[in-house]
């Protein structure tokens, strides 16, 4: 080993070196939180970049750059350090027009804390392992969601466009002429029935067990879907989103009530199956896999 490499190894394994880097990262994070940093912080930024460059140089000299098993770039944690330094120099010395987007990468410096604190490194390692193990469960989840999304698509396509329409029109008005002129919220409120405080027209259906319209209104299929058009089963992607919403139980009771009002109460069976399978079984299966991965990592 050359004298330079010996010195680099000594520095690298010294506890003070680790302490210096940890303090630098934490101080850097504090400086990043400043709203309107004074001009002198620019020099501090250069100091931080200098320390990170010194750290990487020490590691490269001690371990080698990329040829060999234990070299600098063979450790994924060092990729992060390398990216941080590259972006630090890029944003400082290269004129790339919209630098603000690149300056966002400065936040990656905070992630350097993980590689310095051993406990944190273990937890993140476990997290990555759990994600690897989750791949099979994720495939199963996506498959189940896709199957139910296709069923939902067949059962409820277009149903959430059913609305209660006013039974009195001007002489020159027909359903189609109104459909072609509906634009503003005011237009919708003129022709459709709204429950007090509701932002969407009252849903209805054509089957006997679906929601019925009040007197003076008739059920028609016109206009957009509820919730600004985001709630529907009209395409596979929207149906998939609706199913994901059921699985995560994100205000799912509203989707359930809307669909049952438009399609009929019989379809509650669909929701019972989806909630039991998707929400109770698959979510807990995911949690079980994550728990197992942490357990394995700890052992």
């Amino acid at each position: 080993f050359s004298p330079l490499r010996r010195i680099s190894i000594k520095i690298l394994v010294h506890s003070l070196f680790s302490m210096l880097i940890m303090c630098t990262i934490l101080t850097n994070c504090i400086f990043m939180t400043m709203n309107n940093p004074p001009d002198w912080t620019k020099n501090v930024e250069y100091t931080f970049t200098g320390i990170y460059t010194f750290e990487s140089l020490v590691k490269i000299l001690a371990r080698g750059f990329c040829v060999g098993e234990f070299t600098f770039l063979r450790d994924p944690w060092n990729w992060l350090d390398f990216v941080v330094i590259v972006f630090a120099y890029l944003t400082e010395f290269v004129n790339l027009g919209n630098v603000s987007a690149l300056r966002t990468f400065r936040v990656l410096r905070a992630l350097k804390t993980i590689s310095v604190i051993p406990g944190l490194k273990t937890i993140v390692g476990a997290l990555i392992q759990s994600v690897k193990k989750l791949s099979d469960v994720m495939i199963l989840t996506v498959f189940c969601l896709s199957v139910f999304a296709l069923i939902g698509l067949q059962l409820f396509m277009g149903n959430l466009k059913h609305k209660c329409f006013r039974n009195s029109l001007e002489n020159n008005e027909t359903l189609e002429s109104i459909m072609n002129t509906l634009e503003s919220e005011e237009d919708f409120r003129k022709y459709f029935y709204y429950l007090e405080g509701s932002k969407d027209a009252l849903l209805c259906g054509f089957s006997t067990d679906s929601g019925q319209c009040p007197e003076g209104y008739t059920c028609v299929k016109i206009g957009r879907n509820p919730d600004y058009g985001y709630t529907s089963f009209d395409t596979f992607s929207w149906a998939f989103l609706a199913l994901f919403r059921l699985m995560t139980q994100d205000y799912w009771e509203n989707l359930y009530q809307q669909t049952l009002r438009a399609a009929g109460k019989t379809y509650m069976i669909f929701f019972v199956v989806v909630i039991f399978l998707g929400s109770f079984y698959l979510i807990n299966l995911i949690l079980a896999v994550v728990a197992m991965a942490y357990e394995e990592q700890n052992q």
Partner: nanobody, 124 residues
Framework: EVQLVESGGGVVQPGGSLRLSCAAS?????????TGWYRQAPGKQRELVAR???????QYADSAKGRFTISRDNAKKTVYLQMNSLRPEDTALYYC?????????????????WGQGTLVTVSS
Amino acid sequence: EVQLVESGGGVVQPGGSLRLSCAASSRQFIRDVFTGWYRQAPGKQRELVARIYNEGNTQYADSAKGRFTISRDNAKKTVYLQMNSLRPEDTALYYCLFSGTISTGREYRSGDYWGQGTLVTVSS
């Protein structure tokens, strides 16, 4: 293809009567907002004569008030237009319009569905 079957048109003398029928007997017709009669005289635009909403309330053009009566038979899915005291200016092609929802088998579709038209000629 959705079809409305119109009948009852013909030649009648001024002051005479005619009864037009519009049958939406196909199972495709689910629910209407209204079913109405429109007419189009040669060289003129199509205009409303009378219409009946699904709850039974009616609406007439000024020219039809007091002379024409629109009614419906829900069991037969048929709408009638009883035309009395006919005048030469009533000569036109009379169209039936189902404005509501149909079923295509796969989904529901709302819109305007017109008949082929039946000719009414009032002349002496």
